[in-house]
C-alpha cells in the first residue's frame, strides 16, 4: 500500500473520519481521500451534490449531509452502493423517489427527518436498499399510501414518523414483519381502526402519544402479539374499552397519561395478562371500583397520580398481587385514609405507596391494613393533623416514611408517634410541627416534651350519636341522625356518604346547641332526610363531621328498602289421577326477593315430602309431586316471605283413582238356612258406585237380601239352594269400572251322608 493520502484541505481528520462540517461549503471539496469511511458534510450550504466527487471513495460507509440545502435525495455516484448510513435531516427535500434510492444497495440507516416531505407513496421506497432504520420525523406528511413501505418489508426495524400531519392510518397500513419500533407521536390521528397494525408481527414499541385519538376501535392493536410498550399519552381518550386491547398478549407497559379517561372498565384487561406497568396519570378518574383491575395479576407499577379520585371501593385493588409501586399522588382520597379500611387489600407485594397531596387530614388506624410489606410510604403534601395510634405499626418493613405537615394537633393521642418514628429510624423524612395547642405551635413533634402531649379538650369533633341501621317500606320517608361534640368554636361542616361516596345534593338539616353538662362544649347534629324511598336508596350511610382540626366519621348505618311480597303466579286447584305428576305454580315479587315455601294442610311433614316425591324448581316457580298417591290430596299453601312480611295462597289437590278392591272377594260355601256375607271393599276417587250381579243379571233383591248404604256389603239370610251361583261386584267411577267375583256354593241342611261325613 502506498502512502496515506493527506486530509482534504477544508476538513479535519481523525482516524478514518473526515470532518468537513460547518465550513460554509457550497460544493464538495475536490480532494476527498480514498481512505474515508465516515464523511461529515453537515451544516454547509450544499444545494446539490456532484456524484463525480464520490468516484474514488471505496471505503465510504457513513455520510452526514444534514443541515444543508438539498431539495432531493442525492446520488453519491459509485459510492452509493456501499454507503451504509446516510443522514439527510434538516434539508429542503420535498419528496422521495424510488429511483433516487435504487443505487443504495447497502443502505441500512436513512435519516430524512426535518425536511419538507408531504406524502409517502408506494413508489418511494423500492425493493433493494436493506434499510433497517428510517427516520421521517418532522416533515409535513399528511398522506401515507397503503403499502408505502412494503419495499422495505424484509429489512426495516425502526420507522420514525413523529411530528408529521398524519390524520388517519389505513387499515393494514404497514406490511413490515421485522419492524420493532414505530414512532407516530405528534401527528393528528383521531381514530385507530381495527386491524390498523396487522402486518407488524415483530413490533415491540409503538408510540402514538400527542395525537388527537379519541377512539380505539375493537381490534385496534390486533396482530401486535409481540408488542411490549404502547404509548398513548396526551390524546383524547375517554375510556379504554375491552375490545381495543384485544391481541396485546405480550404488552409490558401501557402509557395512558394525559388523556380524559374517566372510568376503568374491569373487562378488557384480561387481554393484557403480562402488563407490568400501567400509567393513567393526569386523567379524569374519580373512582376506583371493586376489582376494576383484578385481571392484571402481573402488574408491578400502577401510576394514578393527578386524577380526581375521591372514592376507592373496598377490594378495588383485588387481584393485583404483583403490584410493587402504587402512585396516587394529587388525588382526593382523604376519606380512604381517614376512615376506610380494606381499600388496599390484595396488594400483598406492594413496596411503595405515594399519596402526596391528597388533602389527608388524619390517618386512621386501619387505613393501610393489607400493606404489611410496605417499604416506602409518602404522605407528604398533606396537612395531617392526627395519626391514630399504631396506624403504621404493622408495616414491619417500612424504611421510608414521608410526612410534611405543620398542622399537627399535638395532644395525648399523638404522644405515641415521635418515639415510634425514632425507634424505627423513620424520622429523617418526617417534618411534623404542631399547630395546636397554641403553646406548642410551630414546635417539631420530636422536640415537644412528653408531658406536653395532653388532652385538655377535644378540638376534633367526636361522634356522640351514631346513625342507626333501619328498614323502610318503599315510598316511606326516613331519616338518619348523627351528632358530634367539640370544644372548638371552629366552623363545622356536615356531609353524608352513601356507600363511601359523598351525597352531593343531600336533603340535610343541621343544628347546633351548647352541651347541657358543659357550657364550653358545642353539640352539632345533622339529620339526613330520604323522601319516598326507592330501592335506589338502599346502601350504607355515614355522616362526616369536619372542622379545622379534622373529620370524624360515624359508623355506617344500613338502609334496607322493602316491599311486601305480592304474587305473580298463584297455584290453582287441580284434579289428577294417581301415579301421575302434580304441578303447582307459585311466584312472588318483593324486596328483598321473597322466599317461597310450601305446606300441606297447614304442616310441612306430609307424604310427598317424607317420601322424597316432592320437587321444587326455584327457577321455574313450580312445585312438583311425582307418582301421586291418594294421600297427597289436600290443601296446599304457598307462602311468600321476606323481611317486610308474608302472604299465602291455597290450592286444593284432588287425586282421582280407578276403583279397586281393598280385600279380595273370595268364593264361599254355606249350608241352607245359614247367613252369608260378601264384602266388596272398594277404594277409588271419586268413591266408586257398587252394583251386585248374580250370573249376568243385576241381583234381584228379596227381603232376605240386605245391602249396606254404600253397597259394599251384601248379606243374604236363610240361604236357599237357589242362592248358589256366581256373584259379581261391579265398582264404577268416572275413571272406569272394575269387577270382582265370588262363587257361592249352597249345601243341603246339616245332616249325615251315607259315607259318614257331616253335611254343612
Amino acid at each position: 500500500a502506498g502512502p496515506r493520502a493527506p486530509c482534504a484541505a477544508a476538513c479535519t481528520c481523525a482516524g478514518d473520519s473526515l470532518d468537513c462540517g460547518g465550513r460554509g461549503l457550497a460544493a464538495l471539496p475536490g480532494d476527498l481521500p480514498s481512505w474515508t469511511r465516515s464523511l461529515n458534510l453537515s451544516y454547509n450550504k450544499l444545494s446539490e451534490i456532484d456524484p463525480a466527487g464520490f468516484e474514488d471513495l471505496p471505503n465510504l460507509q457513513e455520510v452526514y449531509l444534514n443541515n444543508n440545502e438539498l431539495t432531493a435525495v442525492p446520488s453519491l455516484g459509485a459510492a452509493s452502493s456501499h454507503v451504509v448510513s446516510l443522514f439527510l435531516q434538516h434539508n429542503k427535500i420535498r419528496s422521495v423517489e424510488g429511483s433516487q434510492l435504487k443505487a443504495y444497495l447497502s443502505l441500512e440507516v436513512l435519516d430524512l427527518s426535518l425536511n419538507n416531505i408531504t406524502e409517502v407513496r408506494n413508489t418511494c421506497f423500492p425493493h433493494g436498499p436493506p434499510i433497517k432504520e428510517l427516520n421521517l420525523a418532522g416533515n409535513r406528511i399528511g398522506t401515507l399510501e397503503l403499502g408505502a413501505f412494503d419495499g422495505l418489508s424484509r429489512s426495516l426495524l425502526t420507522l420514525r414518523l413523529s411530528k408529521n400531519r398524519i390524520t388517519q392510518l389505513p387499515v393494514r397500513a404497514f406490511k413490515l414483519p421485522r419492524l420493532t419500533q414505530l414512532d407516530l407521536n405528534r401527528n393528528r390521528i383521531r381514530l385507530i381502526e381495527g386491524l390498523t397494525f396487522q402486518g407488524l408481527n415483530s413490533l415491540e414499541v409503538l408510540k402514538l402519544q400527542r395525537n388527537n385519538i379519541s377512539k380505539l376501535t375493537d381490534g385496534a392493536f390486533w396482530g401486535l402479539s409481540k408488542m411490549h410498550v404502547l404509548h398513548l399519552e396526551y390524546n383524547s381518550l375517554v375510556e379504554v374499552n375491552s375490545g381495543s386491547l384485544y391481541g396485546l398478549t405480550a404488552l409490558h407497559q401501557l402509557h395512558l397519561s394525559n388523556n380524559s379517561i374517566a372510568r376503568i372498565h374491569r373487562k378488557g384487561w384480561s387481554f393484557c395478562q403480562k402488563l407490568h406497568e400501567l400509567v393513567l396519570s393526569f386523567n379524569n378518574l374519580t373512582r376506583l371500583d371493586e376489582e376494576s383491575l383484578a385481571e392484571l395479576s402481573s402488574l408491578s407499577v400502577l401510576r394514578l397520580s393527578h386524577n380526581s379520585i375521591s372514592h376507592i371501593a373496598e377490594g378495588a385493588f383485588k387481584g393485583l398481587r404483583s403490584l410493587r409501586v402504587l402512585d396516587l399522588d394529587h388525588n382526593e382520597i382523604s376519606g380512604t385514609i381517614e376512615d376506610t379500611s380494606g381499600a388496599f387489600s390484595g396488594l400483598d407485594s406492594l413496596s411503595k405507596l405515594t399519596l402526596f397531596g391528597n388533602k389527608i387530614k388524619s390517618v386512621a388506624k386501619r387505613a393501610f391494613s393489607g400493606l404489611e410489606g410496605l417499604e416506602h410510604l409518602n404522605l407528604g403534601g398533606n396537612a395531617i393533623r392526627s395519626v391514630q395510634f399504631d396506624a403504621f405499626v404493622k408495616m414491619k418493613n417500612l424504611k421510608e416514611l414521608h410526612i410534611s405537615s405543620d398542622s399537627f394537633l399535638c395532644d395525648c393521642q399523638l404522644k405515641w408517634l415521635p418515639p415510634w418514628l425514632i425507634g424505627r429510624m423513620l424520622q429523617a423524612f418526617v417534618t411534623a410541627t404542631c399547630a395546636h395547642p397554641e403553646s406548642l405551635k410551630g414546635q417539631s413533634i420530636f422536640s415537644v416534651p412528653p408531658e406536653s402531649f395532653v388532652c385538655d379538650d377535644f378540638l376534633k369533633p367526636q361522634i356522640i350519636t351514631q346513625p342507626e341501621t333501619t328498614m323502610a317500606m318503599v315510598g316511606k320517608d326516613i331519616r338518619f341522625t348523627c351528632s358530634a361534640a367539640s370544644s372548638s368554636s371552629s366552623p363545622m361542616t356536615f356531609a353524608w356518604k352513601k356507600d363511601n361516596e359523598v351525597l352531593t345534593n343531600a336533603d340535610m338539616e343541621n343544628f347546633v346547641h351548647v352541651h347541657a353538662q358543659d357550657g364550653e362544649v358545642m353539640e352539632y347534629t345533622t339529620i339526613l332526610h330520604l323522601r319516598q324511598v326507592t330501592f335506589g336508596h338502599e346502601g350504607r350511610y355515614q355522616c362526616v363531621i369536619t372542622n379545622h382540626f379534622g373529620s370524624t366519621y360515624s359508623h355506617k348505618a344500613r338502609l334496607t328498602v322493602n316491599v311486601l311480597p305480592s304474587f305473580t303466579k298463584t297455584p290453582h286447584d287441580i284434579t289428577i289421577r294417581t301415579t301421575t305428576m302434580a304441578r303447582l305454580e307459585c311466584a312472588a315479587t318483593g324486596h328483598p326477593n321473597p322466599q317461597i315455601a310450601w305446606q300441606k294442610d297447614g304442616g310441612t311433614d306430609f307424604p310427598a315430602a317424607r317420601e322424597r316425591r316432592m320437587h321444587v324448581m326455584p327457577d321455574d316457580d313450580v312445585f312438583f309431586i311425582t307418582d301421586v298417591k291418594i294421600d297427597d290430596a289436600g290443601v296446599y299453601s304457598c307462602t311468600a316471605q321476606n323481611s317486610a312480611g308474608s302472604i299465602s295462597a291455597n290450592a286444593t289437590l284432588t287425586v282421582l283413582e280407578t276403583p279397586s278392591l281393598v280385600v279380595p272377594l273370595e268364593d264361599r260355601v254355606v249350608s241352607v238356612g245359614e247367613t252369608v256375607a260378601l264384602q266388596c271393599k272398594a277404594t277409588g276417587n271419586p268413591p266408586p258406585r257398587i252394583t251386585w250381579f248374580k250370573g249376568d243379571r243385576p241381583l234381584s233383591l228379596t227381603e232376605r237380601h240386605h245391602l249396606t248404604p254404600d253397597n259394599q256389603l251384601l248379606v243374604v239370610q236363610n240361604v236357599v239352594a237357589e242362592d248358589a251361583g256366581r256373584y259379581t261386584c261391579e265398582m264404577s267411577n268416572t275413571l272406569g269400572t272394575e269387577r270382582a267375583h265370588s262363587q257361592l256354593s249352597v249345601l243341603p241342611a246339616a245332616g249325615c251322608r251315607k259315607d259318614g261325613t257331616t253335611v254343612g
Epitope: I422, S439, F446, P450
Partner: antibody, heavy 117, light 106 residues
Framework: QVQLVQSGAEVKKPGASVKVSCKAS????????LHWVRQAPGQRLEWIGW????????KYNEKFQGRVTLTADKSASTAYMELSSLRSEDTAVYFC??????????WGQGTLVTVSS | DIQMTQSPSSLSASVGNRVTITCRAS??????LSWYQQKPGKVPKLLIY??SIHSGVPSRFSGSGSGTDYSLTISSLQPEDVATYFC?????????FGQGTKVEIK
C-alpha cells in the same frame, strides 16, 4: 455537631445569686427545649427546669420555684439559669442539656457552683 | 413526683459477664425511661432512651421494660464499662433520676 458550652465555675456566699450561661451551637436554638440539671456531691441528679427558646416558655421544679429563673437570648443562642438565695446545699455541678424523647442527649460540660461563707 | 429506685446500688462482675441493672418507677412512665453512664469527673452520657432506643453506643448495651419496671443489660462487660449508671424518667415533670448503680470489674 451539637455543642453546649457553659460558663466557668463560680464561688458564691450564702444568700447571693448565681447566673450560669449555656451557649448552643450546631442546631436551631429556638427549636429545642433546654433543661437544667444539677448534681450535688454524692447525690443523685436533680432536675431544675426547662425553657423553650422559641417562645420563652418555662417550667420549673417546684422545689426551686421562686428561686430559679430561666431565660434565653435568641440572638446569642444562649440560655441562662439564675439561682438566688443561695445556700450551702446548692453547692453542685450545674448542667444544661438538650432533651429528646424524655432523655438528655446532649449535655454542657457542667459549671461548678460553690456556696461557702 | 415519681420516685425512681435502682438496684443494685453497686455490683462487681468479670469481663465478658452479662450484667443487668433494674429500675422501678413509682408509677407508669409509658416507656419514657433513659439510661446514662457517668464516669468520675465526667458528664453523664446517654446510652438508651425511650426504654430501648440506642443513642449511638455499642450494641452490647440494651434496654427493655414497660409500665413501671425497666432494665439495662450489658451483654458482655468490658473494662471501659466501669462507671456509675443512672436511670431517668421523662414522662412527667419534674424529671427524676435513680440514685445510680456503680459497676466495677472483679
Amino acid at each position: 455537631q451539637v455543642q453546649l458550652v457553659q460558663s466557668g465555675a463560680e464561688v458564691k456566699k450564702p444568700g447571693a445569686s448565681v447566673k450560669v450561661s449555656c451557649k448552643a451551637s450546631g442546631y436551631t436554638f429556638t427549636s429545642y427545649y433546654l433543661h437544667w440539671v444539677r448534681q450535688a456531691p454524692g447525690q443523685r441528679l436533680e432536675w431544675i427546669g426547662w425553657i423553650y427558646p422559641g417562645n420563652v416558655n418555662t417550667k420549673y421544679n417546684e422545689k426551686f420555684q421562686g428561686r430559679v429563673t430561666l431565660t434565653a437570648d435568641k440572638s446569642a443562642s444562649t440560655a441562662y439559669m439564675e439561682l438566688s438565695s443561695l445556700r450551702s446545699e446548692d453547692t453542685a455541678v450545674y448542667f444544661c442539656a438538650r432533651e429528646e424523647l424524655g432523655g438528655f442527649a446532649y449535655w454542657g460540660q457542667g459549671t461548678l457552683v460553690t456556696v461557702s461563707s | 413526683d415519681i420516685q425512681m429506685t435502682q438496684s443494685p446500688s453497686s455490683l462487681s462482675a468479670s469481663v465478658g459477664n452479662r450484667v443487668t441493672i433494674t429500675c422501678r418507677a413509682s408509677q407508669d412512665i409509658s416507656n419514657y425511661l433513659s439510661w446514662y453512664q457517668q464516669k468520675p469527673g465526667k458528664v453523664p452520657k446517654l446510652l438508651i432512651y425511650y426504654t430501648s432506643i440506642h443513642s449511638g453506643v455499642p450494641s452490647r448495651f440494651s434496654g427493655s421494660g414497660s409500665g413501671t419496671d425497666y432494665s439495662l443489660t450489658i451483654s458482655s462487660l468490658q473494662p471501659e464499662d466501669v462507671a456509675t449508671y443512672f436511670c431517668q424518667q421523662g414522662n412527667t415533670l419534674p424529671r427524676t433520676f435513680g440514685q445510680g448503680t456503680k459497676v466495677e470489674i472483679k
